[in-house]
């Protein structure tokens, strides 16, 4: 259940997709990836206030218990709900290969 | 890829399953759930240091970028990898019903 998409903290402050530009060196991939040389990494960043983009019942429970016991139970966390694939040209034992990674780029975000 | 399960922060400090006891009132369920009266809520709590229980490639990227840009990119977050179902006896328009919720109790945790 994707609950409210209205962010009570102000525009852009709540859980949403962000793009962070990263080089192969930044990612620690320079020794095994040939291409792309730079990745526009899409990731989920932002706060998860009460019922904002709650992924499921567990997220709703977490919100309730965080309100009651903030020192024990953390607030829900902004994480990918789905991913976009990414194709890398990578080094192999015999040379070079195209490989698809299905869990690399966040496509959509929710709170859990 | 489930990476290292050794917690460098000390025993019990890293992402793992915790149980939190909660009443129907705590959960805000008292008006629609009859049973159980109390729930042993299993949830994922703890830190996600570098490569600890990394759920996938995205989590590994997040770790690398958090190390480089801690003010921009948050560390991976401890969330459920899978769930246990839970059966609730709940009120309906016509009386009472058994309902299974598949996404209520965390069964296993990882960092993402």
């Amino acid at each position: 259940a994707r609950n409210g998409d209205h962010c009570p903290l102000g525009p852009g402050r709540c859980c949403r997709l962000h793009t962070v530009r990263a080089s192969l060196e930044d990612l620690g991939w320079a020794d095994w990836v040939l291409s792309p040389r730079e990745v526009q990494v899409t990731m989920c960043i932002g706060a998860c206030p009460s019922q904002f983009r709650a992924a499921n019942m567990h997220a709703q429970i977490k919100t309730s218990l965080h309100r009651l016991k903030p020192d024990t139970v953390p607030a829900p966390c902004c994480v990918p709900a789905s991913y976009n694939p990414m194709v890398l040209i990578q080094k192999t034992d015999t040379g070079v290969s195209l490989q698809t990674y299905d869990d690399l780029l966040a496509k959509d975000c929710h709170c859990i | 890829a489930r990476n290292g399960d050794h917690c460098p922060l000390g025993p019990g400090r890293c992402c793992r399953l915790h149980t939190v006891r909660a009443s129907l009132e705590d959960l805000g369920w008292a008006d629609w759930v009859l049973s159980p009266r109390e729930v042993q809520v299993t949830m994922c709590i703890g830190a996600c240091p570098s490569q600890f229980r990394a759920a996938n490639m995205h989590a590994q990227i997040k770790t690398s970028l958090h190390r480089l840009k801690p003010d921009t990119v948050p560390a991976p977050c401890c969330v459920p990898a899978s769930y246990n179902p839970m059966v609730l006896i709940q009120k309906t328009d016509t009386g009472v019903s058994l309902q299974t919720y598949d996404d209520l109790l965390a069964k296993d945790c990882h960092c993402i």
């Epitope: 291409s35 792309p36 976009n84 194709v87 040379g95 | -």
Partner: antibody
Framework: QQLKESGGRLVTPGTPLTLTCTVS????????MTWVRQVPGKGLEWIGI?????NTYYASWAKGRFTISKTSTTVDLKITSPTTEDTATYFC???????????????WGPGTLVTVSS | DVVMTQTASPVSAAVGGTVTINCQAS??????LAWFQQKPGQPPKLLIY???TLASGVPSRFSGSGSGTEFTLTISGLQCDDAATYFC????????????FGGGTEVVVK
Amino acid sequence: QQLKESGGRLVTPGTPLTLTCTVSGFSLSSYDMTWVRQVPGKGLEWIGIINNSGNTYYASWAKGRFTISKTSTTVDLKITSPTTEDTATYFCARGILVYADYGDHNLWGPGTLVTVSS
Amino acid sequence: DVVMTQTASPVSAAVGGTVTINCQASEDIYTNLAWFQQKPGQPPKLLIYAASTLASGVPSRFSGSGSGTEFTLTISGLQCDDAATYFCLGVYTYISADGAFGGGTEVVVK
């Protein structure tokens, strides 16, 4: 280490045709394979790649028109519904071509001619 | 879709001269580019890979340069045997992978 295409022949439009690239001297579980075609007297066209684990990648124009698959010793290219525009020599090659494999090898088959005509 | 645009044919030069062929990619393909030589009735022969690395057995008269979207093949000290058609190939990867050859450039040796 060798590649040899086969299966090229005269077909009528709409009749599916499968071309086979038979490899010897190396394992397909270690190498990506590329299919390329050349219309008589024209340029080269990149059709697609099957990687070492069997994932396929196609040129946008080739999606739906071709299917690449493999066994332990062969790589197949199926032309799903040939048209006269698919008349060409079809080549298989080892690797993704823009980078060389270790040992600097770049293997191509001699090609097989497909003629589509009614 | 990646599109490779290559110097128009034909290009001619005298024996001992220099020929330059350009190839432009519609996307940033980094160094995912190769150059091939093809003669009639034969499969293409790899000359340059990774934009600038000479393939084994290829004379050093052939050289490649460029990255991103602009690439060049240079043949210096032209010989009669260099008369052929030359193709660039680029591969673009991101959410998927796509490859394309340039249209080919015929080199005529005078």
